[in-house]
């Protein structure tokens, strides 16, 4: 029985040209995590394997960095980076857990404008 739950950073927004950290956390299970995959829609961004370390997909190599922890840092954001991101935890013996993050990349002026009206 799969008892674990994935907590994520949820829906996040960032400014075009900036960077963002995608993070998930698996809790409520004693299953051993063996690998975490990061995907954007159906495209693989990165893999972190317990024995082999990180592999970043060649198409993202210049603007994706591992960390912090099992998270992923996306740099030099463009509006095309807007969309769903998934962290896929491969565990033993539970199997696979998936978390979802929605990222919206905003034009600089929009991000600045929106920030003025945030509730403290």
């Amino acid at each position: 029985m799969m008892t674990g739950t994935i907590e994520t950073t949820g829906n996040i927004s960032a400014e075009k040209g900036g960077s963002i950290i995608l993070q998930c956390h698996l809790s409520s299970t004693t299953a051993q995590v063996t690998q975490v995959n990061w995907e954007q829609q159906d495209q693989l961004l990165a893999i972190c394997n317990a024995d082999l370390g990180w592999h970043i997909s060649p198409s993202f190599k210049d603007r994706v960095a591992p960390g912090p922890g099992l998270g992923l840092t996306l740099q030099s954001l463009t509006v095309n980076d807007t969309g769903e991101y998934f962290c896929i935890y491969h565990t033993y013996p539970d199997g696979t857990y998936t978390g979802r993050i929605f990222l919206e990349v905003l034009e600089s002026s929009v991000a600045e404008h929106g920030a003025r009206f945030q509730i403290p």
Epitope: E7, G53, R63, A65, P68, Q75
Partner: antibody, heavy 117, light 107 residues
Amino acid sequence: QAYLQQSGAELVRSGASVKMSCKASGYTFTSYNMHWVRQTPGQGLEWIGSIYPGNDGTNYIQKFKGKATLTTDTSSSTAYMQISSLTSEDSAVYFCAREGWLSLDYWGQGTTLTVSS
Amino acid sequence: DIVMTQSQKFMSTSVGDRVSVTCKASQNVVTNVAWYQQKPGQSPKPLIYSASYRNSGVPDRFTGSGSGTDFTLTISNVQSEDLAEYFCQQYKSYPYTFGGGTKLEIK
């Protein structure tokens, strides 16, 4: 088995710069973040920053931004840290450490830096 | 920055005893905490990751626990070779930060 070999002790004048190295072996250098940590005599561990050799992406703690520069040479599997504008407060042991699965799992033996006035 | 506080700088224990080293984070770090052991004149050695998982080769007398802001490293059946300083470290966010360390003294 991963292994990190750091360069030897340095005695440097105040105001000068120093560049120390950390040669990695026994694993794929571009698959792991490399971190730098310093320890002053009788004190704790202070994280300086990290670098991902796959694309040289870096992170620094605020106090070392502009003071420490992290680089790598993937052809020789070596990480470097340059520290500028040295003062006596920079005298410490500097460690490089590989970030493995959720911990800094392999550490170099440390490079002792002594800054003289 | 997240501050990791190890309130006890020194702890004294005897061989065979059980001792607990504590670490408090200034904000929620979930279980993104590692523990290290550093013996005099040596580099730090990883003991625990994800707050409670032992690194490879670490004796099972070392146990980590906690989540959120409060973490504990427990050494049961303390041995003379456990004389060392113990550091916690968070990797929830950059910059990574360490606790100030707790030196374990064997009576």
